[in-house]
Every structure is written in structure tokens, then in C-alpha cells.
């Protein structure tokens, strides 16, 4: 058993049928010595008396808010949560496996640049009685500071019969140098509590591996005289690290017909312009990627050929 | 990534082309190592990230772009003298650079070259003959060093009398390649910045 926060405790249980569970001793936070009784949640049934209460915690029915009283007055509370260990592996019931980029990916994180700011998000089908708390650091043995905000509900989607909820959090490394070569990964730890169930999820990454630039901005077409060709031009996104000559991007320019089956013409360039043939009803899209370290491509920025 | 490669024109900053070749070569070598050594811990998540140049060179600090010198987090151990030698310094354009920058890059390359050659000698003794260093990568390191044209004492190749542990050697190869790829990215950024300055 360990303390998650003041008066909230997590009991770790080896979770299998007929498991013996864990013996837990609760102590009433009071100078009083006698006349103390204990109850669980809203029940008035007295579970025991005395300054300490010993309970055998086996199932969720044994978890909850234990309260010690004296003469009708509440003295203190202890909330017990359960953390299930199933065959040596901590349960992952609360969050959905996003399966990207690999199985057992519960937290996904992205950064728009090398400033040390990043966003993580996760999915759940649970809509109520759910709380998250996020901590982060650079490295784990001698951790350096990363400050995270509060997790917020950022999207709701309908997936078949189920509703899916996306939560996200923004974090910022306290002293980040964009040009630094990372040798210790960022660690992100999310505590999730659903009713009386506690779970924790972690992700470990280098900022360089989660970079995903914003799409190029100011995408424009300039028709070339007496030709079906157009000059496409764009600019680096505002959110990308500067100077751009040091943090350079490379670009992919795509001409896509109206039908998805039509052949796509693609050109790769390090410049911020390209000359392409603009077909009728086609659209031109441009996306960006770090020129020197192949992390994710940005989303496409698009304009119609017409 | 198969991108069209532009051939640098002669007036271009002389080292840019070599640094691009270096990054391509080390990335290819790392990919080959990860495929060949699939049963070894060779991914970024599995290896310890060690920098053999740590406390010996200060490439990131010495080659920091001017715009980032205002960022206190980037100024841990920044030196402040200016570069005056080295053939990559094609013009006064690079006068903003600190004395350490290109010589620091040269020292990095020299250290990695020695490590890779020593490692290759060990790998050639492996009866499994599972993996060797790409000669193209070694050649590209050499070309960039020649283009940098710094005079420095030659570091003798380390020779080891004891029987090599091939498992450990292959893991060390992965660690070296990951670190060298990160340094090659920094070198490419620096060369690109110098070229634009």
C-alpha cells in the first residue's frame, strides 16, 4: 500500500480468483484514543472500533472511503483504491490501446518544434468518475524538470456503438535548448483513477522522435505564362524552430486528381517553391518534415488547381 | 527516404555536400545494423545513449547559431573565441563562428573514425561474419575531415590483445551509430546554417 496523495491510498493486488488479497491497517488521524468507530462509504454499518482498523482487501467491494467517527463526528477519511496486477502485468482497463505506432501504445505525444514543448493525448470509453494527473521529467534517475498542465477533455467521437473520449495535456521542459542533442529521454507518467480503480501509464521518448511540424503556411499558386505549369510557393510554419537555416525542413509537393485512384505526382524539395503541372480539378498539397532527422511528416496544406 | 539529391555548385559552402553525404551514410549504416542485429538490443529505446565526445569536444555549444545565444539553456559551456582557420571557412561569412566550431566537428569525426576502425577490426574476426562497417561511411568521414583540413595529431588506432566479445562489440556498434547519427544531424544543421550565413 502506498499514498497517492493526502488521505488517498493505493492497494496493489495480485488479481486472480480466490486470491488472498492484502491485509491493510488503517489508522484514524486523531489524538482521540477511545470511542472510535469505522464505516465504509455511505453505509452506517460499523466495521470495527478503535484507533486502527485491520481489513483484508481482496476485491473492489473492499475498497472505498473508510471513515473514523467519534460520537457522530467525523475524525478522518482514508480512500482506498485498487491497482490490479494480472499475471505480473499491471492492468490497463481505463485507457484504450491506440496501436500506433505499435501495440500497447496508450499515450501518444507530439512536438511542433524543438522548444521542449510537447502535447500528449490518450483515449478512453469511460465518461464519468474519471480523473487524470500527469507528471513528466527528463531522465528518471536524476530527473530534470518538465512542467505539465492539467489534462483536459479535448475531443469526443462516436466509434460504432461506443463513445470515445480524448484527453490531452501540454508539457514544457523547464530549461530546453532547441539545438541540444538529447541523451536522456523525456518520461511522461499519467495516473488514472476510475471510481475505485487506479492505473498508471508511462511513455518515454526523445523530442526529436516525436517532432511533427505544422503544415506549411501561405501556400500559393502562380501560373506560368503559356504553360500548364504553375509555380507553387509556401513558407515555413510559424511554430517551427528558428533559425530556419539551422532547423531546416524538407517538403513533399503532391498533385492529386479529384479521384483518389488517380495517380499522384510527387516532388521532394528543400526549397520553399516548386514548379508542377496543374491538372483540371486537381489540388496541390505540400507537407513538411525535418530535413535531417526523419520524424513525422506534417499534415498536408492544400489549394485547388483552379 | 529517396529524395532527389541536388549537386552543390562550386561556389557553395564547401563542407555542406560532404556533411549531407555523411548523414546519408550513417543513417543507412544504422538501418542496416538494426535489420542485421534484430535479435540484439539495437533500437533507440533499448540502447544506452552514450556520447564518446562528451567532455572532449563541445560541438553543440561551439556551433550554436547566433540566434540561440540569447537562450540561457543553450549557454552551459559556451566558448567565445572566433574561428580563423580551416578550409571550410570559404569567406568572411563565417566570422560569427566561434573558434571551436569546425575544429570541434573535426575532432568529433576523428574520434568516431578511430572507434569505427577499431570496431571493424574486431568485427572482421567474428566467425559469424554478421556485420561490418560500410566502407562508404568510413570514406565519407575521411572526405569531410579532409575538407575541414585541420591539422591535428593523429590518434593511434586502439589495439586490443584480449579476445573480443562479439556480442558486446555489436551492442557497442549500435550505441556508436545512434550517437554518430545524432552528431551527423548537428553537423548538417551547422553546415546548412553556415552556407546560408
Amino acid at each position: 500500500i502506498w499514498e497517492l496523495k493526502k488521505d488517498v491510498y493505493v492497494v496493489e493486488l495480485d488479481w486472480y480468483p480466490d486470491a488472498p488479497g492484502e491485509m491493510v491497517v488503517l489508522t484514524c488521524d486523531t489524538p482521540e484514543e477511545d470511542g472510535i468507530t469505522w464505516t465504509l462509504d455511505q453505509s452506517s454499518e460499523v466495521l470495527g472500533s478503535g484507533k486502527t482498523l485491520t481489513i483484508q482487501v481482496k476485491e473492489f467491494g473492499d475498497a472505498g472511503q473508510y471513515t473514523c467517527h467519534k460520537g457522530g463526528e467525523v475524525l478522518s477519511h482514508s480512500l482506498l483504491l485498487l491497482h490490479k496486477k494480472e499475471d505480473g502485468i499491471w492492468s490497463t482497463d481505463i485507457l484504450k490501446d491506440q496501436k500506433e505506432p505499435k501495440n500497447k501504445t496508450f499515450l501518444r505525444c507530439e512536438a511542433k518544434n524543438y522548444s521542449g514543448r510537447f502535447t500528449c493525448w490518450w483515449l478512453t470509453t469511460i465518461s464519468t468518475d474519471l480523473t487524470f494527473s500527469v507528471k513528466s521529467s527528463r531522465g528518471s534517475s536524476d530527473p530534470q524538470g518538465v512542467t505539465c498542465g492539467a489534462a483536459t477533455l479535448s475531443a469526443e467521437r462516436v466509434r460504432g456503438d461506443n463513445k470515445e473520449y480524448e484527453y490531452s495535456v501540454e508539457c514544457q521542459e523547464d530549461s530546453a535548448c532547441p539545438a541540444a542533442e538529447e541523451s536522456l529521454p523525456i518520461e511522461v507518467m499519467v495516473d488514472a483513477v476510475h471510481k475505485l480503480k487506479y492505473e498508471n501509464y508511462t511513455s518515454s521518448f526523445f523530442i526529436r522522435d516525436i517532432i511533427k511540424p505544422d503544415p506549411p503556411k501561405n501556400l500559393q499558386l502562380k501560373p506560368l505564362k503559356n504553360s500548364r505549369q504553375v509555380e507553387v510557393s509556401w513558407e515555413y510554419p510559424d511554430t517551427w524552430s528558428t533559425p530556419h537555416s539551422y532547423f531546416s525542413l524538407t517538403f513533399c509537393v503532391q498533385v492529386q486528381g479529384k479521384s483518389k485512384r488517380e495517380k499522384k505526382d510527387r516532388v521532394f524539395t528543400d526549397k520553399t517553391s516548386a514548379t508542377v503541372i496543374c491538372r483540371k480539378n486537381a489540388s496541390i498539397s505540400v507537407r513538411a518534415q525535418d530535413r535531417y532527422y526523419s520524424s513525422s511528416w506534417s499534415e498536408w496544406a492544400s489549394v485547388p488547381c483552379s | 527516404r529517396n529524395l532527389p539529391v541536388a549537386t552543390p555548385d562550386p561556389g557553395m559552402f564547401p563542407c555542406l555536400h560532404h556533411s549531407q553525404n555523411l548523414l546519408r551514410a550513417v543513417s543507412n549504416m544504422l538501418q542496416k545494423a538494426r535489420q542485421t542485429l534484430e535479435f540484439y538490443p539495437c533500437t533507440s529505446e533499448e540502447i544506452d545513449h552514450e556520447d564518446i565526445t562528451k567532455d572532449k569536444t563541445s560541438t553543440v555549444e561551439a556551433c550554436l547559431p547566433l540566434e540561440l545565444t540569447k537562450n540561457e539553456s543553450c549557454l552551459n559551456s559556451r566558448e567565445t573565441s572566433f574561428i580563423t582557420n580551416g578550409s571550410c571557412l570559404a569567406s568572411r561569412k563565417t566570422s560569427f563562428m566561434m573558434a571551436l566550431c569546425l575544429s570541434s566537428i573535426y575532432e568529433d569525426l576523428k574520434m568516431y573514425q578511430v572507434e569505427f576502425k577499431t570496431m571493424n577490426a574486431k568485427l572482421l574476426m567474428d566467425p559469424k561474419r554478421q556485420i561490418f562497417l560500410d566502407q562508404n561511411m568510413l570514406a565519407v568521414i575521411d572526405e569531410l575531415m579532409q575538407a575541414l583540413n585541420f591539422n591535428s595529431e593523429t590518434v593511434p588506432q586502439k589495439s586490443s590483445l584480449e579476445e573480443p566479445d562479439f556480442y558486446k562489440t555489436k551492442i557497442k556498434l549500435c550505441i556508436l551509430l545512434h550517437a554518430f547519427r545524432i552528431r551527423a544531424v548537428t553537423i548538417d544543421r551547422v553546415m546548412s546554417y553556415l552556407n546560408a550565413s
Epitope: 486472480y16 494480472e86 501495440n103 | -
Partner: antibody
Framework: QVQLVQSGGGVVQPGRSLRLSCAAS????????MHWVRQAPGKGLEWVAF????????YYADSVKGRFTISRDNSKNTLYLQMKSLRAEDTAVYYC????????WGQGTMVTVSS | SYVLTQPPSVSGTPGQRVTISCSGG????????VKWYQQLPGTAPKLLIY???QRPSGVPDRFSGSKSGTSASLAITGVQAEDEADYYC????????????FGTGTKVTVLG
């Protein structure tokens, strides 16, 4: 004490269907994940499928994906395996089993797929 | 397809020490716990070892398990005639959990 009693096995022709049941008692069935495991005659153990305690997630071996469906009725304390498009290679003893560091197995039920 | 490899058979005379190996990889045994089962003819598997080296109550202490790196082993010290059975190791793969990964199985024969 924990008990898992299986039923539903038998002889079936290729291409036909069969449903296996596993009745649980002696524990809070709705709190635990459950597996199906099979063993072809003279062969080793092969995992078939898993279902979460609340039925929210199901996992299948590639060899049965799209043909077999694992389900549970927590009100009846029963686990099911619906098997469709049966093949000769599905012939095996099928076991249900609890998920956890200490597990409990059903007695097994024989499924024979033969024309 | 079995990812955990066991020897097809091992044998020993009563009182001898018999060991069965179970070889896997970094993503299964290297990252997860190992269990061992004993299966007597015509019966369901019985749990002998869980959590690499833990014995459930009721399992004789002549059975012991261990794990090192990407391999695990089961030892029977002082093998007895009633130990003649098939033995299976089981683990998980970190990418496919909760799918159970079973070993290929080992037939233990007690000679004499």
C-alpha cells in the same frame, strides 16, 4: 472453491458451427478476464482467445480470427466460444481458463471436425 | 507458431536432477514473467511455477523455476516416477499481451 465446467463439444462437419460453454462458480466471475486454449491430439497447447472482465476487449489468435467469437454473460457466470466455418485443423480439446498469476482450468471438451 | 522453444524430451532416473529450458526473446521472456505447467495424460494442465520462480501452495518443493535474460528453466531435483508428464512454459509478448505464448512442450521420462 473455483470451478469451471465446460460443455458443448462434439463431432461436427467441416464448415459447420459449434458453441462451447464454460460455467464458472466459486468466484466473482465478472471481475476476471478469461481465456480459451486448445490442444490438438498429440500436440502442444495453443492459445485461442481472451476476453476482458467486462467483455469490452476481445483478442484472438490469427488462426481463428474472423471465424471464432469469444463472449461472456456475467449475469449467468458463463463464458462462450462460438466457432464457425470449422476446419479439420480445429480438431482439439478446448479448455477455458481464468486470467491471472494463479489460474484455474476447465476439464476440457473435445471438438472433432470431420466429414 | 511457437516462439518459446523447449527440448522435445528429457529423461532421468529417480532421484536425479532434471532441467527443462525455455528459450524466447527480448519481447517475451525478456520483458515478462514465465509460468510452468505440468500436464498428465488426459488431464488439464496444472500450474507448477508462476512469476518465474514462485511455487503455488501444494506444489512439491522439488520443482523450481528460474529466469535469466531471454531464457527460463524448470528444474526437478530428485525426479520421481509420478513426475513423468508433459511440461510447458508460458509467457506473454509485450506487443500481443494478453495472448498467451506457450512453449513447444517437453516430455519428461523417468527411467527405470
Amino acid at each position: 472453491q473455483v470451478q469451471l465446467v465446460q460443455s458443448g463439444g462434439g463431432v461436427v462437419q467441416p464448415g459447420r458451427s459449434l458453441r462451447l460453454s464454460c460455467a464458472a462458480s466459486g468466484f466473482t466471475f465478472s471481475s476476471y478476464g478469461m481465456h480459451w486454449v486448445r490442444q490438438a491430439p498429440g500436440k502442444g497447447l495453443e492459445w485461442v482467445a481472451f476476453i476482458r472482465y467486462d467483455g469490452s476487449n476481445k483478442y484472438y489468435a490469427d488462426s481463428v480470427k474472423g471465424r471464432f467469437t469469444i463472449s461472456r454473460d456475467n449475469s449467468k457466470n458463463t463464458l462462450y466460444l462460438q466457432m464457425k466455418s470449422l476446419r479439420a485443423e480445429d480438431t482439439a480439446v478446448y479448455y477455458c481458463k481464468t486470467h491471472g498469476s494463479h489460474d484455474n482450468w476447465g476439464q476440457g471438451t473435445m471438438v472433432t471436425v470431420s466429414s | 507458431s511457437y516462439v518459446l522453444t523447449q527440448p522435445p524430451s528429457v529423461s532421468g532416473t529417480p532421484g536425479q536432477r532434471v532441467t527443462i529450458s525455455c528459450s524466447g526473446g527480448r519481447s517475451n521472456i525478456g520483458s515478462n514473467n514465465v509460468k510452468w505447467y505440468q500436464q498428465l495424460p488426459g488431464t488439464a494442465p496444472k500450474l507448477l511455477i508462476y512469476g518465474n520462480d514462485q511455487r503455488p501452495s501444494g506444489v512439491p518443493d522439488r520443482f523450481s523455476g528460474s529466469k535469466s535474460g531471454t531464457s527460463a528453466s524448470l528444474a526437478i531435483t530428485g525426479v520421481q516416477a509420478e513426475d513423468e508428464a508433459d511440461y510447458y512454459c508460458q509467457s506473454y509478448d509485450r506487443g500481443t499481451h494478453p495472448a498467451l505464448l506457450f512453449g513447444t512442450g517437453t516430455k519428461v521420462t523417468v527411467l527405470g
